[in-house]
């Protein structure tokens, strides 16, 4: 009803047409620069109400110093110059990280306000003759249905439980312990892993496409934008949670291999079959070797049974196998698998998902491998609660079901997970995990024990502060009598100087006022935020404390419901926006009911098609009907009639 | 499929009155909730009154209350609307809709409008 609709998923979009040939410049200049991290890419572009000036360089940290990359039996040390991480310049907190191709930035931008995702056009819109090349849209237009079907997303309690089974019949192979494990001072032993084990953080990883994904994405460089942007963004979730003490969890990757559509024919190519189920496909990744690295990945572009996203072999701290650093060993079927792995398809019921449902289709399936099952109990599926303080915040990552996304709680781990994970890490991450990386002076990023941070001597054009060049104990720091440098935000002159109180540092946004200096500080400060239950979004949503966050309901004292299907409700009304009084479901009735004429007058606000409904138990298709999803359906009784369980299994292969 | 034929719009003065009727095409109606929206140049469509099918229970907008009085005739399938006391911020095109039995219903059927201008 509201909007510029990009597909079944993204409900607003707005186009991008900034120079593609000079962007295109820079980054090959940036590519020939001495040091490969020397140089600033800059991009400047307005959308969706704000400018962007974003402040870019090459992101070294995600790939590992022997990083290969493997495709149609060549190995390439390849080159990522094209891989960029940054931020917007000026605005303290944000983020940005993507790939530049063909003069084309595609990736995601975090800011105060929420995550842009910019994408390519032509990945949604065929006409040739568009005014614009890429699209750019902010996570709120999402409308992210993260798992759909009974488990949404990750397929069913079954199939997990036929997983289980087989993980306790591993045969471990029998290996010399070192010498100094022997050792009789038990206590100082662990003393000094504790010690070495505080640095081993980084989770190094193995991701292989098959060749529907490169054909979806067309090119290696796509391909490889695709893969950094998913890493780096689990990298950001698993980085910020605290398991149990165990912090800055981080991943790198070590080797990738792209099945390209060469391969499609190749037969030593385990992925080249049009039509694999989502176990049979988890079984090929996991057949193959993967000792060296802490997880393996397959991405896929298939469109799975029951709205599966994502598989994964759950980790455990002992008496099971699989997950995090898991080695290859012999199985009750005869054959030796890595355990290891997971695999993440970009396709579900025929679309693409944006790239902010894979990035959490991810984050699940990892946190499968780090040891957490699905959430469940009161206390880690708020989402479910009748008490509508906790249902409010949502579900977290490990939710097994549908999720909107958009809640407070689904980016973030719940205890139950958290308890899971750190046990698992307590016991495993020595066995795998290598040390990270420090901050980087010269990356035009102030860190931690950084004053500033103005680049190589070649790029910084600031009188204020030590370039990254100079000696230790002054790289990065102001020189002496200076008051603060650019570097450390837009608050600060050329001259070294804290601007003057009045100067306006960011513009208005939807839901919040200009940013203004305050001649105290180089940052700019907090913007005032807009009056809450100010309309955002076009319409479609309220600013509550300068985001564009709440419901439309909420502009009303009303709450956001689920329009569940009872007392005679017409099936139509659970694809609508519906609302009720404050801790009353009995209220909950469609925007467009003759309850709500008065907030409303009669428009019916829907839900994007792909969203959940009915508390959850299916999905709104294109016709605004919500399908339920059965998960014993037709199909999977037929099989089950025809086919005894063992027969199957050798057809299967 | 119901159909809805509003009528009884013009230029009135302000302060002068005016009666709207809707009739709609079939008898299912003597059940449902009907009622008045209105929409002015450039603005977004607004509530107006509704009112149940036995005719027991009504709303009105606040920025019409105790000046517009809305009632049905279940006999001759018609809506009604009286206006008294216009203002010139009430010019708009007033449209009849017809929504389901349960106050949780949903708008369905709308009627295709007419033209109430007040003139200061």
């Known amino acids: 009803q509201y909007g510029n609709p990009l597909n079944k998923y993204i409900r607003h979009y707005e186009g991008l047409s900034y120079n593609v040939d000079s962007l295109h410049q820079k980054h090959q200049r940036a590519k020939r620069a001495v040091s490969h991290e020397d140089q600033f890419l800059r991009l400047d572009f307005h959308a969706h109400g704000r400018h962007f000036n974003l402040r870019m360089k090459r992101d070294t940290s995600l790939f590992s110093d022997e990083f290969k990359v493997e495709t149609s039996n060549k190995v390439l040390d390849y080159d990522t110059s094209h891989i960029y991480t940054g931020h917007i310049y000026g605005e303290e907190g944000s983020f940005s990280h993507g790939s530049v191709i063909d003069g084309r930035f595609e990736g995601f931008i975090q800011t105060r306000g929420g995550t842009f995702y910019v994408e390519p056009a032509e990945r949604y819109i065929k006409d040739r003759t568009l005014p614009f090349h890429s699209v750019i849209y902010h996570e709120d237009d999402i409308n992210y249905p993260h798992k759909y079907g009974p488990q949404g997303g990750c397929a069913d309690h079954s199939v997990f439980e036929r997983m289980r089974k087989y993980q306790m019949t591993g045969v471990e192979e029998v290996t010399q312990i070192p010498q100094e494990e022997h050792a009789a001072n038990g206590p100082e032993l662990l003393r000094k892993k504790r010690t070495t084990s505080a640095e081993k953080n980084t989770c190094q990883l193995y991701i292989q496409t098959d060749h529907l994904f490169f054909k979806y994405y067309g090119t290696r460089e796509a391909v490889i934008a695709q893969i950094s942007s998913h890493v780096k963004a689990i990298d950001t979730i698993y980085q910020t949670t605290d398991f149990s003490g165990i912090r800055n969890i981080s991943f790198m990757v070590k080797r990738i291999r792209i099945n390209t559509t060469a391969d499609e024919k190749d037969p030593t190519n385990p992925f080249r079959f049009p039509n694999i189920g989502v176990e049979k496909f988890l079984e090929l990744n996991s057949e193959q070797n993967h000792d060296d690295y802490c997880l393996a990945y397959v991405f896929t572009d298939r469109d799975f049974d029951d709205g599966v996203l994502g598989l994964a072999w759950v980790g455990a701290p002992s008496g099971s196998s699989g997950g995090i650093c898991e080695k290859s060993k012999l199985y009750s079927d005869g054959k030796k698998k890595s355990l290891n792995t997971g695999i993440i398809t970009v396709q579900n019921y025929g679309s693409h998902v944006p790239p902010k449902v894979s990035h959490i289709t991810f984050a699940h399936e990892v946190g499968h491998n780090f040891g957490s099952p699905h959430d469940s109990g009161t206390e880690c599926t708020p989402g479910e609660s009748k008490n509508l303080g906790q249902k409010e915040n949502g579900n977290y990552i490990m939710y097994a079901r549908a999720t909107s996304g958009d809640k407070l709680n689904n980016n973030k781990f719940s205890l139950c997970s958290i308890r899971n994970i750190s046990q698992v890490l307590e016991k495993k991450r020595n066995n795998c995990f290598v040390e990270s990386g420090q901050p980087i002076c010269g990356n035009g990023m102030v860190e931690q024990g950084e004053e500033c941070d103005c680049g190589y001597s070649d790029q910084c054009k600031d009188e204020c502060c030590f370039d990254a060049n100079q000696p230790e104990g002054r790289k990065c720091k102001l020189k002496p009598g200076k008051q603060c440098s650019p570097s450390q935000g837009p608050c600060c002159t050329a001259q070294c100087a804290f601007k003057s109180k009045s100067e306006k540092c960011r513009d208005d946004s939807d839901c919040a006022r200009e940013g203004i200096c305050n001649g105290f500080t180089a940052l700019c400060p907090a913007s005032d935020p807009k009056p809450n239950f100010t309309d955002c979004n076009r319409h479609t949503q309220v600013c509550i404390n300068g985001q564009c966050a709440g419901s439309i309901c909420e502009k009303y004292g009303l709450e956001e419901c689920t329009c569940a299907s009872s007392d005679g409700k017409d099936d139509k009304e659970l694809c609508h926006v519906c609302c009720m009084k404050k801790m009353d479901p009995s209220t909950c009735a469609s925007t467009g009911s003759v309850q709500w004429s008065r907030h409303f007058s009669g428009r019916t606000i829907t839900l994007q098609p792909g969203s959940p409904c009915n508390d959850f138990r299916g999905y709104c298709d294109v016709f605004m009907r919500c399908r339920l999803v059965d998960a014993d359906g037709p199909l999977a009784r037929l099989k089950k009639a025809i086919f005894s369980p063992e027969l199957y299994e050798n057809i299967a292969e | 499929e119901v159909q809805l034929v509003e009528s009884g719009g013009g230029l009135v003065q302000a302060g002068g009155s005016l009666r709207l009727s809707c009739a709609a095409s079939?008898?299912?109606?003597?059940?449902?909730?009907m009622g008045w929206f209105r929409q002015a140049p450039g603005k977004e469509r607004e509530f107006v009154a509704f009112?149940?099918?036995?005719?027991?229970?009504?709303d009105y907008a606040d920025s019409v209350k105790g000046r517009f009085a809305i009632s049905r005739d279940n006999v001759k399938n018609t809506l009604y609307l009286q206006m008294s006391s216009l203002k010139p911020d009430d010019t708009a095109v007033y449209y009849c809709?017809?929504?389901?039995?349960?106050?949780?219903?949903?708008?369905?059927?709308w009627g295709q409008g007419t033209q109430v201008t007040v003139s200061s």
């Open positions: 009112i149940s099918g036995n005719g027991g229970s009504t």
């Open positions: 809709a017809v929504a389901g039995r349960q106050i949780k219903s949903t708008w369905d059927y």
């Open positions: 079939e008898r299912i109606f003597s059940t449902y909730f």
